[in-house]
Amino acid sequence: AWELTILHTNDVHSRLEQTSEDSSKCVNASRCMGGVARLFTKVQQIRRAEPNVLLLDAGDQYQGTIWFTVYKGAEVAHFMNALRYDAMALGNHEFDNGVEGLIEPLLKEAKFPILSANIKAKGPLASQISGLYLPYKVLPVGDEVVGIVGYTSKETPFLSNPGTNLVFEDEITALQPEVDKLKTLNVNKIIALGHSGFEMDKLIAQKVRGVDVVVGGHSNTFLYTGNPPSKEVPAGKYPFIVTSDDGRKVPVVQAYAFGKYLGYLKIEFDERGNVISSHGNPILLNSSIPEDPSIKADINKWRIKLDNYSTQELGKTIVYLDGSSQSCRFRECNMGNLICDAMINNNLRHTDEMFWNHVSMCILNGGGIRSPIDERNNGTITWENLAAVLPFGGTFDLVQLKGSTLKKAFEHSVHRYGQSTGEFLQVGGIHVVYDLSRKPGDRVVKLDVLCTKCRVPSYDPLKMDEVYKVILPNFLANGGDGFQMIKDELLRHDSGDQDINVVSTYISKMKVIYPAVEGRIKFSTGSH
C-alpha cells in the first residue's frame, strides 16, 4: 500500500493576513486565525512528518480584500510560490480582472501547474495562453506519480469576466476524456481538483470513471468528522464518501473558505491505484499554530503599499452620500442607490443577445451601510472612506430566487418599520411601494422589477412563480437580518466580489458621482 497526504485550501479570497474568527479583519491577534504565515507553519510541519504530501488549491484565491485590489494577483503567485503549492485549479474569481489579469500576474508567475480541463481557449487567445494552464498534470510524488485534473464552474461567464475567447464546457463531459488519457498513460492515482461547488463535486465523484478523489471549492462547504472546532456547521462528514456508478467509494473534500482551515486527507492506495482507505479532517488554523516569522516578515513588507493605497483618491462625489442610519433604515438613501448601482454595474455580462444583461436587480440591507461620506472634503472618496461605509468585509453575491421569495423579503423589510432596524432594504432595478397602515406581512402594495430580456429596460410587475437573478450582500444570502426566506428558498447562490472593491471600482470608473433619491422606494399616501 502507498499513502498520500492531501493538504488543500479553497476560496481563500485574498486572506493573506490572519483574520478574526468570522474571516473579517483581525482585531485581537491572540484570537485570530488563518493567513499564509500560519498556513506555512502547519504545511511545513506536515511535510517534515509525512513522506508523500501534496498541497492543492481548488480556486478562488483572487478577490476579497484590499490585497487583491492593490496587487491584482501578484500577491497570490508570490505567496502560493512561497508555500510551494503543488497545483491549483482555476476558480471563477481568477477571471475577475479579465484574462490578462490572470495571465500576467498569476499564470506566468506561478511555479506550480494551474489546471482546468473544461476551459478551452479559442481564437487569438489560444496561442497566447497555450501551456500557461493545463487540463491535467502528472506530478511525481515520492516514487509514484499522481494525476491531477482540474475543472472550473461553467457558470464563470455569468460570475466573472473571462471574455469571449474562453469556452467553459460541462465539467463531466470535459473531465472524462482527460481521465481516460491519464489511465492510458498508466497513471492510476487521479485527483479531480476543481471549483464548481459541492453538488458538482459529488456528481464528478459519481460519474467520472477513474477519479479516485475529488478536492473541491466554490460552495465554501465545511465538512467535519466529530465535534467541529469553531463556528462552522458541517454539511457532512470529512471526507464525504460518494459511491460511483461503477461501485467505487470516492472521497470528496472541501475546506470551507478564507484560509481558516487546512484540509487534511490521508489516502491509502493499493498497488493498482485503488483507494483502500481515506480519513482526515480540516485543521483549524487558530492561534495555537504560530505564524512563520519569515513569511510574516514578507507579509509586513508587502503590507506597506496597502496602507498608502487606502488614502489615495478613487474619485469624487459632488453630493452628500447619505449613509446615515436615520435615512438608510427608514427610506431610500442615495448611498444605498450608489451601492446598488455599483453592484449591478459590476455584474454587467452581455452573454446573450436576447438579454441586455443577465441580472437587473439589487437588494441591500440598510443596516449594512455604516457611514455617510461628506462631499465637503473636496469631494474626495478614498478606500478608507468606503471601509467606514462597508466595514464588514462581505461580498456582493448573485442568487436566483422566485418572485414569491422576493415578495416575502420585502414584507420582512418593513415588518417592524420605525425601530431603526437593519433589515430595511435599499434597492436597484426595483420599484417598491409600501403601505405601513396595513398589518405586517401585507405591507407591499406594489413591486415592479426591471426586465432583463428586453432591449429597452422597463419596470414590470413582479411575477410570483418566475425565477429572478438578484445581486445582494452575502450577509443576506446567508439569512442575515432575519432574511431566513432568502437562505431557505434560494435556488442558486454564487459568491461575488468584495463589497468595497465593487463600489471603489465603480467610483473610479465614473470619476465623479452624484447619486440621487429618485423614487425607488415609496410609501403610499397617508401612511408615512
Epitope: 502528472v138 511525481p140 506519480v145
Partner: antibody, heavy 122, light 110 residues
Amino acid sequence: QVQLVESGGGLVQPGRSLRLSCAASGFTFDDYAMHWVRQAPGKGLEWVSGISWNSGSIGYADSVKGRFTISRDNAKNSLYLQMNSLRAEDTALYYCAKARGYSYGEGAFDIWGQGTMVTVSS
Amino acid sequence: SYELTQPPSASGTPGQRVTISCSGSSSNIGSDTVTWYQNLPGTAPHVVIYSNSQRPSGVPDRFSGSKSGTSASLAITGLQSEDEADYYCATWDASLKAVVFGGGTKLTVL
C-alpha cells in the same frame, strides 16, 4: 548574479566512482527543483536526474538508474550527483540546471552551469 | 534513442523563416508543456521558449513556439547569423517519470 558552478569532473576508470557538485548562488536555492543534464562529445542533450525542492521526489534516466544518486543540501545551496559503476558511455559534459518550478516533473530549466567534464576511460 | 523526434538539420538564408518540428507521444508532449533550448557552440544551453509558446525576457520576438496534440514546433522569423546553433525540445514524460529531450536540430544560416 544567478549562477551555477559545477565541479568534481575528471578522468576516471570504468567501474569507479565520482561525485559531482554544483554550487548555486544568486537565488533562493530551496525554491526550485534541480537537475543534472549531460552531453556526450558530438551528441545531444540527455537528462540524467532531477530532484524536487525538498528532495521529496527524485527521478533518474533509465541509463543511470541504480548507479547514480542525486542529492541536495539546501543549507549549503548545493546539488550533488554520486556516480558509481561508471561506464565509457557516461563520458560527457555534465551540466547542473535549475528548474523554473519546484517539482522535478517539468522540462524547463532556466539557469544552466557551464558544465564539468567526466571522462570514463581505462 | 530519443523519446522526442527532431529533424537532424535545418537551414535558411538571412531574413527567412524556418521552423523546427518536435514529435512525441501522448505521455510527453501530449501531456505536458514543451521547452525549446538554443545551444550555441561552446556555451551552455538556454531557453528560448517555455510553456509551448512563452518567450523569456531577452529572447527576440522572432522566436515563437506552438504545440498541437503530440507535436510542437519552433519558428524563427527574420533569420540572423547569430541564430546558427543546435536547438533542442524537451518536456516531462508522465510514463517514464523523466524529462525527455529531442535529439537536437542543427540550424545553419546559409
